[in-house]
């Protein structure tokens, strides 16, 4: 997956930290405070989408040789820059019933963007 | 994850056969000849991203959190529909050497969509 | 600590109007879904309606739709209830509850912290 | 929407009996239901979450299980101040239901 770097407008990954305090939510997040979760940005031409080697991968580069080919409904349908790759973080936090949790949060990090 | 049944118009996951024939695959894939692989189409409006319970919901909720208080950059940043729980399916096909190879290939079925 | 304290109620003519608020303290308001739940004198435990934590979403119960409006204030952490064509029926106490706007592996938080209630007696 | 049949609408038990509230979805919600007690006069306080964990500073006597569509709350041993009314929830879909209800009284 692509790095933004600035220079580059196709789909990639922007760094980026997430402050719990910003969006209120550290009145239920124990720790961390915040972390790098990151995001994805960018155009998705044609050519790249589903190039990315992507978990996405297969099901996105048939759907774009349907996108290619002109084939309804794909002509019209965007790919876009989403997470392809997603790590998970260890959190403590309060849970529903103000229970403190210490858990493996699935899919916080992105890790990689792809085009859909 | 919504189905799509011509009256939505929010992000929904739409059935839809996938013909190797059509994209010129079926001179390496074996079997099947084709499958019902779906695809992912509809709106995001901002309501509604990061709250599918699906696998990209955390990250999705929080840079929601993010974009619905303005902050920069994700005030412009689109949320988009995208597969958020893809299934394997097993397959019958040629590789790079000629050899025929049975194997389950990752996320070719999409079973449901989000918002990223 | 969390509190949420309803006020507006009162004796009120079918067909009137009245806005019930709920002020919110001890908490990131903003990041919170808020619900409306009423109870009818000797009666069961009724949902209302609901707002998303930012205003973008709202849901009421059939019984309400198209008299009562949810609606929220987060600079001044206060909730409200806009009910227009009260009937009989109407007659209740109104809790104003809060929800966490969050959910994982398809478990969606549900209502945590009520308010005392407010009154509404509709009367000619 | 989501019916949520609660039985018994009222039960007589005594101090240090073991009684068992029954709430049925008429279609599948997970785990996304809570147990509520209503003292009169007073608002809902949870007891459970997520059908089955006990909310925090809950006593331990009460208890939730099930999954889907049929979910229990029991209370192991009845205490003078348990008798009162218990209401389900469920919040898996809008609009969010409530059970009718079950009063325990004192036998």
């Known amino acids: 997956g692509l790095e933004c770097d600035g220079k580059v407008n196709i789909c990639c990954r922007q760094q980026f930290f997430i402050d719990f305090r910003l969006i209120g939510w550290n009145d239920w997040i124990i720790a961390p405070t915040g972390y790098y979760g990151n995001y994805c940005e960018g155009e998705c031409p044609s050519h790249i989408a589903g190039t990315s080697g992507s978990s996405l991968s297969f099901h996105s580069t048939v759907i774009n040789h349907y996108r290619m080919r002109g084939h309804s409904p794909f002509a019209n349908l965007k790919s876009c820059c989403v997470p392809t790759k997603l790590r998970p973080m260890s959190m403590l936090y309060y849970d529903d019933g103000q229970n403190i949790i210490k858990k493996d949060i699935q899919n916080m990090i992105v890790e990689e963007c792809g085009c859909s | 994850g919504l189905e799509c049944d011509g009256k939505v118009n929010i992000c929904c996951r739409q059935q839809f056969f996938i013909d190797f024939r059509l994209i010129g695959w079926n001179d390496w894939i074996i079997a099947p000849t084709g499958y019902y692989g779906n695809y992912c189409e509809g709106e995001c409006p901002s309501h509604i991203a990061g709250t599918s319970g699906s696998s990209l919901s955390f990250h999705s909720t929080v840079i929601n959190h993010y974009r619905m208080r303005g902050h920069s950059p994700f005030a412009n940043l689109k949320s988009c529909c995208v597969p958020t729980k893809l299934r394997p399916m097993s397959m019958l096909y040629y590789d790079d050497g000629q050899n025929i190879i049975k194997k389950d290939i990752q996320n070719m079925i999409v079973e449901e969509c989000g918002c990223s | 600590q969390v509190q949420l304290v309803e006020s507006g109620g009162g004796v009120v003519q079918p067909g009137r109007s009245l806005r019930l608020s709920c002020a919110a303290s001890g908490f990131t308001f903003s990041s919170y879904g808020m619900h409306w739940v009423r109870q009818a004198p000797g009666k069961g435990l009724e949902w209302v309606a609901v707002?998303?934590?930012?205003?973008?979403?709202?849901y009421h119960a059939d019984s309400v739709k198209g008299r009562f409006t949810i609606s929220r204030d987060n600079s001044k952490n206060t909730l409200y209830l806009q009910v227009n064509s009260l009937r009989a029926e109407d007659t209740a106490v109104y809790y104003c509850?809060?929800?966490?706007?969050?959910?994982?592996?398809?478990?969606?938080?549900?209502?945590?912290?009520w308010g005392q209630g407010t009154t509404v007696t509709v009367s000619s | 929407d989501i019916q949520m049949t609660q039985s018994p609408s009222s039960l007589s038990a005594s101090v240090g009996d073991r009684v068992t509230i029954t709430c049925r979805a008429s279609q599948g919600i997970r785990n996304n239901l809570g147990w509520y007690q209503q003292k009169p006069g007073k608002a809902p306080k949870r007891l459970i979450y997520a059908a089955s964990s006990l909310q925090s500073g809950v006593p331990s006597r009460f208890s939730g299980s099930g999954s889907g569509t049929e979910f229990t709350l029991t209370i192991s041993s009845l205490q003078p101040e348990d008798f009162t009314t218990y209401y389900c929830?469920?919040?898996?879909?809008?609009?969010?239901?409530f059970g009718q209800g079950t009063k325990v009284e004192i036998k």
């Open positions: 509850v809060r929800s966490r706007n969050w959910n994982y592996d398809n478990y969606y938080y549900g209502l945590d912290v």
């Open positions: 707002i998303w934590y930012d205003g973008s979403n709202k």
């Open positions: 929830l469920q919040h898996n879909s809008y609009p969010w239901t």
